[in-house]
């Protein structure tokens, strides 16, 4: 039985068919971040809940040590939202005095690590200047896109400031991927 | 004919195969909201256009009374964008006088209701402080992620303030879901 | 061999089966924009990288002249992020003097062009007022949703101000679509 028997009239040859319910998938949710050594000029990676509440991994998509491990080559949709929260930044105090300042910022990066490649690859970045004046500010950064990944690739979410990540609710800060 | 006949070399057994065009899918678009009774401390749900313009439901995914009804268990990608718009908030007036204040905020929640479960489950939340000074402000909140849903689950979109939702264009405020 | 042989117990008839790896897909990334003639009251379209770095097109999804060309009818998930960056706007200078002003704004529109239809269709819009005071501001607008497209449809990304688009990194500004 050949895949092309299902081909439409233009007779394109298909790859082997595949049941959707079997595809690698994960949705990870936020947890309180534990202290780890941070390296200067390197955004820290978040760690995640992978089995409680809304979180799950399935079909050989595994989570370990801040990484989602890609079990099978293919095109994946990858997404994350990180909600940040903070108090009035110096930026606003300075600008109130009439001296515009380089704003503070918040950044989320979804990063791919390939063991055979020395440098991580930044797949997605959301970055936003923050120049708030209210005593509490909070806001999400959402990212999502499709990438061709290889078996063994690892995905992580890095943030510019781990101390500002809102860890209070699983629906506010999350990370997921699924094979298309 | 067994699903595993299509299995790659690692001989994993697949679930029955499924044509993609048959999967439950919906994309709903904004309409002017009709006044309804709101309960204190409960975010009101938006209602939606489900067949005109860009909106559609298909393959047994039905829309009724503010809810998308899930016709089949499985993993769904769910998304929504809500564009809010408003006038200068009190927050900015207060802070201009030098008294920082808890900022106003805008929030979108995608909620799952399961009849057999007493409490709704918040799947996704986007929440943002709003401390604007321009006389008119407007901004979107976008959400999207994958969840395992059961047949009969219902999905809705709740917002912190229905009067701030921009209902003027179907491309600004929308809600959708599709079985993966 | 009929599709319905794979149907679950409710005996729904499925469309012909289809291998996922064969579906039209594209992820395009930002490049420095070349000067082109802009028409008044019409948002300029971005052009994109389609084969270098993270960018790709596959399975008859082609990119040409700012457009993604849809090779096959079906339901597509379409997404884009555009990161904008700018200097302090007049809005903030005016409002500091106590005169609230109509804020500047940034807008992204994903547009569908159908040759047989005279007017483009706006599928998705993200629009945000910008009233920043810091000397440099930057922020992304993300969009994504599912649409039923026809073979031959063309997709493009339009922005309110091409000069504010951050073209510096492929992970900051991107555009993609894939057949579900």
């Amino acid at each position: 039985l050949k895949g092309q028997e299902f081909a439409p009239s233009h007779q394109q040859v298909y790859a082997p068919l595949r049941a959707d319910g079997d595809k690698p998938r994960a949705h990870l949710t936020v947890v309180r971040q534990t202290p780890t050594q941070h390296f200067k000029n390197q955004f820290p990676a978040l760690h995640w809940e992978h089995e409680l509440g809304l979180a799950f991994t399935k079909n050989r998509m595994n989570y370990t040590n801040k990484f989602l491990l890609i079990p099978e080559s293919g095109d994946y949709f990858i997404y994350s939202q990180v909600t940040f929260r903070g108090m009035t930044s110096e930026c606003s105090e300075i600008r109130q005095a009439g001296r515009p300042n380089k704003p503070d910022s918040i950044t989320v990066v979804i990063t791919k690590v390939t063991d055979s490649y020395p440098e991580p690859t930044q797949l997605l970045m959301g970055t936003k200047s923050v120049c708030e004046v209210g005593s509490n500010w909070f806001q999400p950064i959402y990212l999502g896109a499709m990438f061709s990944l290889q078996e063994g690739d690892k995905l992580m979410v890095n943030v510019s400031d781990i101390s500002l990540v809102d860890y209070t609710k699983e629906d506010k800060t999350f990370f997921g991927a699924f094979l298309l | 004919l067994k699903g595993q006949e299509f299995a790659p070399s690692h001989q994993q057994v697949y679930a029955p195969l499924r044509a993609d065009g048959d999967k439950p899918r919906a994309h709903l678009t904004v309409v002017r909201q009709t006044p309804t009774q709101h309960f204190k401390n409960q975010f009101p749900a938006l209602h939606w256009e489900h067949e005109l313009g860009l909106a559609f439901t298909k393959n047994r995914m039905n829309y009724t009374n503010k809810f998308l009804l899930i016709p089949e268990s499985g993993d769904y990608f769910i998304y929504s964008q809500v564009t809010f718009r408003g006038m200068t908030s009190e927050c900015s007036e207060i802070r201009q006088a030098g008294r920082p204040n808890k900022p106003d905020s805008i929030t979108v929640v995608i909620t799952k209701v399961t009849d057999s479960y007493p409490e709704p489950t918040q799947l996704l939340m986007g929440t943002k402080s709003v401390c604007e000074v321009g006389s008119n402000w407007f901004q979107p909140i976008y959400l999207g992620a994958m969840f395992s849903l059961q047949e009969g689950d219902k999905l809705m979109v709740n917002v912190s303030d229905i009067s701030l939702v921009d209902y003027t264009k179907e491309d600004k405020t929308f809600f959708g879901a599709f079985l993966l | 061999l009929k599709g319905q042989e794979f149907a679950p117990s409710h005996q729904q008839v499925y469309a012909p089966l289809r291998a996922d790896g064969d579906k039209p897909r594209a992820h395009l990334t930002v490049v420095r924009q070349t000067p082109t003639q802009h028409f008044k009251n019409q948002f300029p379209a971005l052009h994109w990288e389609h084969e270098l770095g993270l960018a790709f097109t596959k399975n008859r999804m082609n990119y040409t002249n700012k457009f993604l060309l849809i090779p096959e009818s079906g339901d597509y998930f379409i997404y884009s992020q555009v990161t904008f960056r700018g200097m302090t706007s007049e809005c903030s200078e005016i409002r500091q003097a106590g005169r609230p002003n109509k804020p500047d704004s940034i807008t992204v529109v994903i547009t569908k062009v159908t040759d047989s239809y005279p007017e483009p269709t706006q599928l998705l819009m993200g629009t945000k007022s910008v009233c920043e005071v810091g000397s440099n501001w930057f922020q992304p607008i993300y969009l994504g949703a599912m649409f039923s497209l026809q073979e031959g449809d063309k997709l493009m990304v339009n922005v309110s101000d091409i000069s504010l688009v951050d073209y510096t990194k492929e992970d900051k500004t991107f555009f993609g679509a894939f057949l579900l």
Epitope: P35, R85, S163, L164 | - | -
Partner: antibody
Framework: QVQLVESGGGVVQPGRSLRLSCAAS????????MHWVRQAPGKGLEWVAV????????YYADSVKGRFTISRDNSKNTLYLQMNSLRAEDTAVYYC?????????????WGQGTLVTVSS | DIQMTQSPSTLSASVGDRVTITCRAS??????LAWYQQKPGKAPKLLIY???SLESGVPSRFSGSGSGTEFTLTISSLQPDDFATYYC?????????FGGGTKVEIK
Amino acid sequence: QVQLVESGGGVVQPGRSLRLSCAASGFTFSSYAMHWVRQAPGKGLEWVAVISYDGSNKYYADSVKGRFTISRDNSKNTLYLQMNSLRAEDTAVYYCARGQVAILDYFDYWGQGTLVTVSS
Amino acid sequence: DIQMTQSPSTLSASVGDRVTITCRASQSISSWLAWYQQKPGKAPKLLIYDASSLESGVPSRFSGSGSGTEFTLTISSLQPDDFATYYCQQYNSYPPTFGGGTKVEIK
């Protein structure tokens, strides 16, 4: 074991300045947010300021904003509170406390406190 | 700012009594609440975090419960070492705020 030891308190006139220090040991100081919390004589606890693990974020209570500055030296495992323009109402025992990674969280270890008296 | 209100402000009890202290938040703080014990002239000591999680080394007679706006600290059988002042603290939103304290004294 975790130890936090405050120093630098004393009697000071209104309008003058004082600098408090907190020496930390028994844990990786550079991985934790650190806070100052004060307690006026016979009163309850009041949060004063926080600094993130790397010093990039500093937040203050409204009552001290613009007058107090929190800082840290991770190479010396030391937290500081520079207090300027002191007022009588700043009289209190000042505690340094260890937070978590997030700057908004609970305090799991406290120092023994140092008394600051603002009086003419 | 979120106001935290403790009751009672003073509580007289005997060794072996079951003691309950209440903390009420002016708005919902989910489960982001801690309880501290302070003895005269000493620093506060963490007992409970996340409303109900017992800090390592704290005796199991201490327990916390509640979510949203209503929280309780319970001492199942009061011991001589437990006579002290107890504070709740919210860390759901900035700035962190404390309750006014509950003094547990010998009856």
